[in-house]
């Protein structure tokens, strides 16, 4: 059946922690992605940004999780209003920012 929201959020946090802790070389060879507004619809916005990164084994599981948690189909080059279209950041920074925000949501009990 569907993954409970709290479980989904916790699993995603654990995976992002794993990425940040195990990072040796520049994550995804220093690939840049669009920054996003960390608000409602964040899972889809994060996927829309990260789906444009390919060949990066370190974030494959994160992409899978975000794809499962986003209710609609997302393809490369797709953008929502949640993107800060004039700001690109490294994947490593994107992951750190997302992780901090998800931890905050988890502490506050905001699972959806």
């Amino acid at each position: 059946g569907p993954v409970p929201p709290s479980t989904a959020l916790r699993e995603l946090i654990e995976e992002l922690v794993n990425i940040t802790q195990n990072q040796k070389a520049p994550l995804c060879n220093g690939s840049m992605v669009w920054s996003i507004n960390l608000t409602a619809g964040m899972y889809c916005a994060a996927l829309e940004s990260l789906i444009n990164v390919s060949g990066c084994s370190a974030i494959e599981k994160t992409q899978r999780m975000l794809s499962g948690f986003c209710p609609h189909k997302v393809s490369a080059g797709q953008f929502s209003s949640l993107h800060v279209r004039d700001t690109k950041i490294e994947v490593a920074q994107f992951v750190k920012d997302l992780l901090l925000h998800l931890k905050k949501l988890f502490r506050e009990g905001q699972f959806n």
């Epitope: 569907p2 993954v3 070389a25 995804c28 060879n29 690939s31 789906i51 444009n52 990164v53 390919s54 060949g55 990066c56 084994s57 370190a58 494959e60 992409q63 899978r64 999780m65 794809s67 499962g68 948690f69 490369a76």
Partner: antibody, heavy 118, light 111 residues
Framework: EVQLKESGPGLVAPGGSLSITCTVS????????INWVRQPPGKGLEWLGM???????DYADALKSRLSISKDSSKSQVFLEMTSLRTDDTATYYC????????????WGQGTSVTVSS | DIVLTQSPASLAVSLGQRATISCRAS??????????MHWYQQKAGQPPKLLIY???NLESGVPARFSGSGSRTDFTLTIDPVQAEDAATYYC?????????FGGGTKLEIK
């Protein structure tokens, strides 16, 4: 335009080694995953292994001990090396590039035929 | 390793009729709501061509007569109506777990 082209020795003696090069154009190997797949004459497809853009390498369990995959991103080349060749390694060898997530094999080379025979 | 078993090994379908190919996985290929099963078409003397990804998504440029369905361990590729140019061998492939694996293939003949 995305292109992949395999080049190999054609004929290899049993017990010998095989080296195949996949030369690509139209994209960078630093952000693309390349798979190696083979197909014996008249038979099905067998996944051999892959190298990710970030350098991680995965191998098929059955061939792990005989297989080595590497790349030179600056030359846009991926390499497959196989040791201790047997006659049942005779096949067409393909390199294939994954598309973006969910990483299905979207772009394929034409393949290179390898015969293991004395 | 996840074993993919295709059936039938071969089939002959009349022009304009429906062709149905099955792929059964030895364990689930689902992960976080998606099925990591893909379908390829291979014509004689050519490399494979991606048709369907994530079980049911049509690859760009592939005719709408091709469709995919299924989840967990049971998947189906349907061609309806079959055209003469669809004569080929079809393979399922999973990448839910390493190593990636292919099914044994199904050869489609057009009557």
């Amino acid at each position: 335009e995305v292109q992949l082209k395999e080049s190999g020795p054609g004929l290899v003696a049993p017990g010998g080694s095989l080296s195949i090069t996949c030369t690509v154009s139209g994209f960078s190997l630093t952000d693309s995953s390349i798979n190696w797949v083979r197909q014996p004459p008249g038979k099905g497809l067998e996944w051999l292994g892959m190298i990710w853009g970030d350098g991680r390498i995965d191998y098929a369990d059955a061939l792990k001990s005989r297989l080595s995959i590497s790349k030179d991103s600056s030359k846009s080349q991926v390499f497959l090396e196989m040791t201790s060749l047997r006659t049942d390694d005779t096949a067409t060898y393909y390199c294939a590039r994954d598309g973006r997530f969910p990483y299905a094999m979207k772009f394929w080379g034409q393949g290179t035929s390898v015969t293991v025979s004395s | 390793d996840i074993v993919l078993t295709q059936s039938p090994a071969s089939l002959a379908v009349s022009l304009g009729q429906r062709a149905t190919i099955s792929c059964r996985a030895s364990e689930s290929v689902d992960s976080y709501g998606n099925s990591y099963m893909h379908w390829y078409q291979q014509k004689a003397g050519q490399p494979p061509k991606l048709l369907i990804y994530l079980a049911s998504n049509l690859e760009s440029g592939v005719p709408a007569r091709f469709s995919g369905s299924g989840s967990r361990t049971d998947f189906t590729l349907t061609i309806d109506p079959v055209q003469a140019e669809d004569a080929a061998t079809y393979y399922c492939q999973q990448n839910n777990e390493d190593p990636r694996t292919f099914g044994g293939g199904t050869k489609l003949e057009i009557k």
